[in-house]
């Protein structure tokens, strides 16, 4: 079974800068999975942001600001990366990655 690890416990960024969050997949080939990214703001329900499927297809939640989030995967390091552009107050949250095994 696949296992996920988010090595950064926290990430502190200056406003308007870029944040990159990592999710390391083990126990399964990342190219054979879909990785989903979610965020949870304080006092709010968890929200789907973006996913990258086993074939590289990217799906973004409607209503998410255009160009705010970018998702990628690096097979060599078995890592999925969520990039948050122009970090703002509303981006302060806990971000989770999740796995769907094909």
């Amino acid at each position: 079974a696949g296992h996920l690890e988010q090595p950064q416990i926290s990430s502190t960024k200056t406003l308007s800068k870029t944040a990159r969050l990592e999710c390391v997949v083990s126990g399964i080939t990342i190219s054979a999975t879909s990785v989903y990214w979610y965020r949870e703001r304080p006092g709010e329900v968890i929200q789907f942001l973006v996913s990258i499927s086993y074939d590289g297809t990217v799906r973004k939640e409607s209503g998410i600001p255009s160009g705010k989030f970018e998702v990628d995967r690096i097979p060599e390091t078995s890592t999925s990366t969520l990039t948050i552009h122009n970090v703002e107050k509303q981006d302060i949250a806990t971000y989770y990655c999740a796995l769907w095994e094909v």
């Epitope: 304080p42 006092g43 160009g67 703002e88 107050k89």
Partner: antibody, heavy 124, light 109 residues
């Protein structure tokens, strides 16, 4: 001195348009979310619209959605509200207001700096 | 949408009295997202409390906020003459609109 100064209000006929401006000084404008809040004569406060520091997140009250557009120019330290298809019920004093910003207590929200307001009257 | 209901509509008190203002949300609001404002006639609103209980800069300690979930309270321990005004609560819930309550007027008895 931290200050917000609104302008652009006036008398307009129903269906008309106005563009409100809010000039900010005394703080780093680009670091703060901004809001428009209005108050009809003798009534309470009504939140109208919000825009995040880099303009990624924009929200409107249902009563103005599709008619009003909020924007900002961080290089000019300015906030704007384009108001189209104005109605009599849009008559109010319009205030721009600054969000409390990001601190160690970053989960907190509130409007800590307010402009004096600009009056919009919609009447035929 | 979350509806904020303030009570009472008007509070008639004397200087030195304790004022207790209530704000009830139609659904749960995170404490981080609850603010209180004061507005005097002809003036812009002034932020008193944010995060349900944190006093804004320059606000005297006679003002305090409390509560969680759907019930929040603003307390003025000893009313000063300058405290007679209208008070509004506001929520910044999970999604807009960021609604205000209808206000509570604190007037001199």
């Amino acid at each position: 001195e931290v200050q917000l100064v609104e302008s652009g209000g006036g008398l307009v006929k129903p269906g008309g348009s106005l563009r409100l401006s809010c000039s900010a000084s005394g703080f780093t404008f680009s670091n703060y979310d901004m809001n428009w809040v209005r108050q009809a004569p003798g009534k309470g406060l009504e939140w109208v619209s919000s825009i995040s520091s880099s303009s990624s997140y924009i929200y409107y009250a249902d009563s103005v959605k599709g008619r009003f557009t909020i924007s900002r120019d961080n290089a000019k330290n300015s906030l704007y509200l384009q108001m189209n298809s104005l109605r009599a019920e849009d008559t109010a004093v319009y205030h721009c207001a600054r969000d409390v910003g990001v601190t160690t207590d970053y989960y907190y929200y509130g409007m800590d700096v307010w402009g004096q307001g600009t009056t919009v009257t919609v009447s035929s | 949408d979350i509806v904020m209901t303030q009570s009472p509509g008007t509070l008639s008190l004397s200087p030195g009295d304790r004022a207790t203002l209530s704000c009830r949300a139609s659904q749960s609001v995170a404490s981080s997202y609850l603010a209180w404002y004061q507005q005097k006639p002809g003036q812009s609103p002034r932020l008193l409390i944010y995060g349900a209980s944190s006093r804004a800069t320059g606000i005297p300690d006679r003002f305090s906020g409390s509560g969680s979930g759907t019930d929040f309270t603003l307390t003025i321990s000893r009313l000063e003459p300058e405290d007679f005004a209208v008070y509004y609560c506001q929520q910044y819930g999970s999604s807009p609109p960021y609604t205000f309550g209808q206000g509570t007027k604190v007037e001199i008895k």
